[in-house]
Interface confidence: low
């Protein structure tokens, strides 16, 4: 099945010459970015990118690795060091603080410097660090947050919240002592800390009082409102803006995104995280690509530009379950959102960055034949005379013993969307990994994204490119035709 043209050196030489020609034409833009988009693949380490690329190709009946993801087309790439101040291997809270605020923090804290301590409310005050999204808003830009997780989840919260505990989604999650000390839950901060123009994702239940039935699952008490303070945060948010609209399903979202009277849009499509792409009810819930498009339609109306955070947040969840099928299909939808955003924006005035907050202990190996299924088996047998998959995890719930030994696996089993790849160490949840992750960049000032950098560098590149604090004296020419 090897393509016959690939046997000819001319094929590779010609391909490389074309790539070299394109590289030679790259000209660093000396203009400022009017718009900023950061695409965050939660848990999307390099092994995940590679495996997703192959899957994307195989879904189009190609062999796999020769395929291009949308992010592969970005001309500038760097590596990001993801450690937090207190841990070699970080979580999504500390990393969000790094790439969104430009300062490293401690494990499981958000929007706070490392002087703050996890779960210690009285260390919050005075240690807040300000996100690039907040700075963009102060500069007159429109801002938005789009995610497939809860909008109060660690990664999006890095754009607007300051909390010593990433798990304080609603006031019901905050200990009474911390509430008395004045620490606020993340949902409250979502509507009160700053004016966010577009908020799209999951997380309905944290916005409504306990006992409020969910509109989609009215008979399921566990999906209803969780708040103890009796507040309807959606109602409070709507009251702040004359042109605000709240939607909770795909149809309403598509209508609202085309309505010129809508200036602020909140769409919460699930009580908690949104469903995995493979489980999504496409009549009720929008895809990440659709949410990204809706956000861009609204935000791009502002002549001063916009800041948009787009998260493929459940790549991470698929990996924690050791279900590579879920992680990789989430990655492909994430890449589809990147592609759609590229069609709706111009690299002349929009700096787009794609990165991950951290990696996972997810590996791809075993010398599989070109074109063989990414979910398939490695050729030959292991020392225990059993088959093994090319995708594996270093640890996680895929560790199973059957009669005291590792179970055998067949191609049909490993190809199932529910299959958990095996691991060396048994854990309830597979863990993050500590190796560097990629940062892809396109647009004004993208050339700054190079080399091996601290994760904090990402926030500083965005701020500098758009001449935001602390780089208001950035000395970059405004893009021709930029309006103010």
């Amino acid at each position: 099945i090897i393509p016959v043209e690939e046997e000819n050196p001319d094929f590779w030489n010609r391909q490389a010459a074309e790539a070299l020609g394109a590289a030679k034409k790259l000209q660093p833009a000396q203009t400022a970015a009017k718009n900023l988009i950061i695409f965050l693949g939660d848990g999307m380490g390099v092994s995940t990118v590679t495996a997703a690329r192959i899957l994307k190709g195989q879904k189009k009946d190609k062999l796999g690795p020769e395929t291009f993801l949308a992010m592969d087309r970005f001309p500038y790439v760097a590596l990001s060091k993801t450690y937090s101040v207190d841990k070699h291997v970080p979580d999504s809270g500390a990393t969000a603080t790094a790439y969104l605020c430009g300062v490293k923090g401690n494990f499981q804290t958000i929007g706070l410097s490392a002087a703050a301590r996890f779960n210690q409310c009285n260390t919050t005050r005075g240690n807040e660090v300000i996100s690039v999204m907040n700075r963009a808003k102060k500069a007159g830009k429109s801002v938005g947050v789009v995610t497939t997780t809860r909008v109060q989840h660690a990664s999006p919260a890095g754009a607007y919240a300051h909390t010593v505990n990433r798990n304080w989604y609603s006031d019901a999650d905050v200990p009474a002592s911390a509430r008395q000390e004045g620490c606020q839950d993340i949902a409250t901060q979502l509507i009160s800390n700053m004016d966010i123009d577009v908020i799209l994702g999951g997380g309905r239940k944290y916005m409504f009082p306990m006992g409020t039935p969910d509109p989609e699952y009215p008979d399921d008490y566990s999906q209803g409102g969780t708040r103890l303070d009796g507040k309807n945060l959606v109602q409070e948010w709507l009251a702040k803006h004359q042109g605000a609209r709240y939607v909770w399903n795909r149809t309403e979202l598509l209508q609202a995104s085309l309505d010129p009277s809508v200036t602020h849009l909140m769409g919460l499509f699930e009580p908690g995280d949104m469903k995995y792409e493979i489980h999504r009810d496409s009549t009720l819930d929008p895809s990440l690509m659709e949410m990204t498009e809706a956000a861009l339609l609204l935000l791009s109306r502002n002549p001063r530009g916009f800041f948009l955070f787009v998260e493929g947040g459940r790549i991470d969840h698929g990996h924690h379950e050791s279900r590579a099928y879920r992680a990789l299909t989430e990655t492909i939808m994430f890449d589809d959102a990147i592609e759609r955003a590229g069609q709706l924006t111009s690299e002349e005035d929009t700096l787009s960055l794609v990165t991950a907050d951290h990696s996972h202990v997810f590996s791809f190996g075993g010398y599989p034949l070109r074109g063989s299924s990414i979910f398939g088996l490695a050729p030959g047998k292991a020392r225990d005379r059993k088959a093994y998959t090319v995708l594996l995890y270093g640890n996680g719930p895929g560790y199973v013993l059957k009669d005291g030994a590792r179970p055998d696996v067949t191609e049909s089993e490993s190809g199932s969307p529910e299959y958990r790849q095996q691991s060396a160490v048994p854990l309830d949840g597979e863990t993050h990994a500590g190796e560097d992750v990629a940062v892809f960049a396109r647009g004004p000032q993208a050339h700054l994204v190079h080399g091996v950098q601290e994760q904090t560098f990402i926030a500083h590149v965005m701020a500098f490119a758009a001449c935001l604090e602390p780089y208001t004296a950035c000395d970059l020419a405004p893009r021709a035709g930029t309006t103010d």
């Epitope: 005050r125 005075g126 807040e128 300000i130 907040n134 808003k137 102060k138 607007y160 300051h162 606020q184 409250t188 901060q189 009160s192 800390n193 700053m194 004016d195």
Partner: nanobody, 122 residues
Amino acid sequence: QVQLVESGGGLVQAGGSLRLSCEVTRSPMPIDTMAWYRQAPGRQRELVAIISRSGSTNYADSVKGRFTISRNDTKSTMYKSTMYLKMNTLELEDTGVYYCNAVGLWNGAEYWGQGTQVTVSS
């Protein structure tokens, strides 16, 4: 909602002193800059003194050397800030309503107090 409460105003003779206070309570966020403005009858509101979160200060030329602005940010997590304006060697021209102003750190929103009357008599 954020509340700003001024106090310390009153009637004082020229050459005398007053100390104004402004307490910011119920703030969901830390306070960035804080300032005192004043408005004399028939005049526009004008900046008197301003103090940043880091403590750097600036004064209107007419009050330099006579007025001192200071602030205290409480070290609890209830975002509470108190600002003071010590006014020495008061002049007739210092008469007016003194307003407290605060800017939210995260949203850049401006908050105002109701004002406190300062009257300097001869």
